[in-house]
């Protein structure tokens, strides 16, 4: 075991937060400020991510882990690890090259990000529109027209209100 260990790369003993320093006989040296090593055995440390401008710091860099950024209010993260910040829009809008634009008729967006999506086509499921769509909300589909024939309703009517102290007839 000792023989195997001595044949190993001496750098493999350097823990996270250090680098294997070739200038100092491969001893483990601490990462400089504003840098980190998240795994052992590294020959250099990595520069900490800096959250500047529209990015703000969600988690500070440490000697063993990179900083994590999110976006300032009015923006949201895009991409792996919040690599980009994109402007928020209002519900009922989408972001275009010219800024936030209202959803076209027949489309909606119920979030501050993303694109306007077409209203659900109730008739494709053989249903009717129960509540009309808006720029911010999708349509609500109700029962199919066939279900609304006299005497057959799949929409349960509300129970009649009773006055206190009266028993049902």
């Amino acid at each position: 075991f000792e023989r195997t260990r001595s044949l190993q790369d001496p750098c493999s003993n350097c823990p996270a937060g250090t680098f294997c320093d070739n200038n100092r006989n491969q001893i483990c040296s601490p990462c400089p400020p504003n840098s980190f090593s998240s795994a052992g055995g590294q020959r250099t440390c990595d520069i900490c991510r800096q959250c500047k401008g529209v990015f703000r710091t969600r988690k500070e860099c440490s000697s063993t882990s990179n900083a994590e950024c999110d976006c300032t209010p009015g923006f949201h993260c895009l991409g792996a690890g919040c690599s980009m910040c994109e402007q928020d829009c209002k519900q009922g809008q989408e972001l275009t090259k010219k800024g936030c634009k209202d959803c076209c008729f027949g489309t909606f967006n119920d979030q501050k990000r993303g694109i306007c999506r077409p209203w659900t086509n109730c008739s494709l499921d053989g249903k009717s529109v129960l509540v009309n769509g808006t720029k911010e909300r999708d349509v609500v589909c109700g029962p199919s027209p066939a279900d609304l024939s006299p005497g057959a309703s799949s929409v349960t009517p509300p129970a009649p209100a009773r006055e206190p102290g009266h028993s049902p007839q």
Epitope: F19, D21, N23, R24, S29, C31, P32, P33, N34, S35, R43, T44, C45, D46, I47
Partner: nanobody, 122 residues
Framework: EVQLLESGGGLVQPGGSLRLSCAAS????????VGWVRQAPGKGLEWVSA????????YYAESVKGRFTISRDNAKNTLYLQMSSLRAEDTAVYYC???????????????RGQGTQVTVSS
């Protein structure tokens, strides 16, 4: 060739002060990220302080914040570490260090000097 020559160490009583100097040659301290590391007896190297982003920010280890001050004299190409309220745990060899940024994105540091011994004892 990069050279770093530390001086100013010595024996001081707890609560006392010292100013360490690092005379640099082969590079310009005002244009690079530079600092101080130390090695206490039987321990590994520890970062103490640094001037980063070409002077835009400074770093201090938690253990020295409020007691140590890093500065530099561009005309003399010299880095300083003013140490006050010294404690026994500050006893170490102090090395001047130049942070090196490699083309591939890696970061290391150089300590070319012999260091200067600081001993805090009554």
């Amino acid at each position: 060739e990069v050279q770093l020559l530390e001086s100013g160490g010595g024996l001081v009583q707890p609560g006392g002060s010292l100013r360490l100097s690092c005379a640099a040659s082969g590079f310009t301290v005002s244009a690079e990220d530079v600092g101080w590391v130390r090695q206490a007896p039987g321990k590994g190297l520890e970062w103490v302080s640094a001037i980063l982003d070409s002077g835009g920010s400074t770093y201090y280890a938690e253990s020295v914040k409020g007691r140590f001050t890093i500065s530099r004299d561009n005309a003399k190409n010299t880095l300083y570490l003013q140490m006050s309220s010294l404690r026994a745990e500050d006893t170490a060899v102090y090395y001047c260090a130049r942070i090196v940024y490699h083309a591939g994105g890696g970061v290391t540091f150089d300590t070319r000097g012999q260091g200067t011994q600081v001993t805090v004892s009554s």
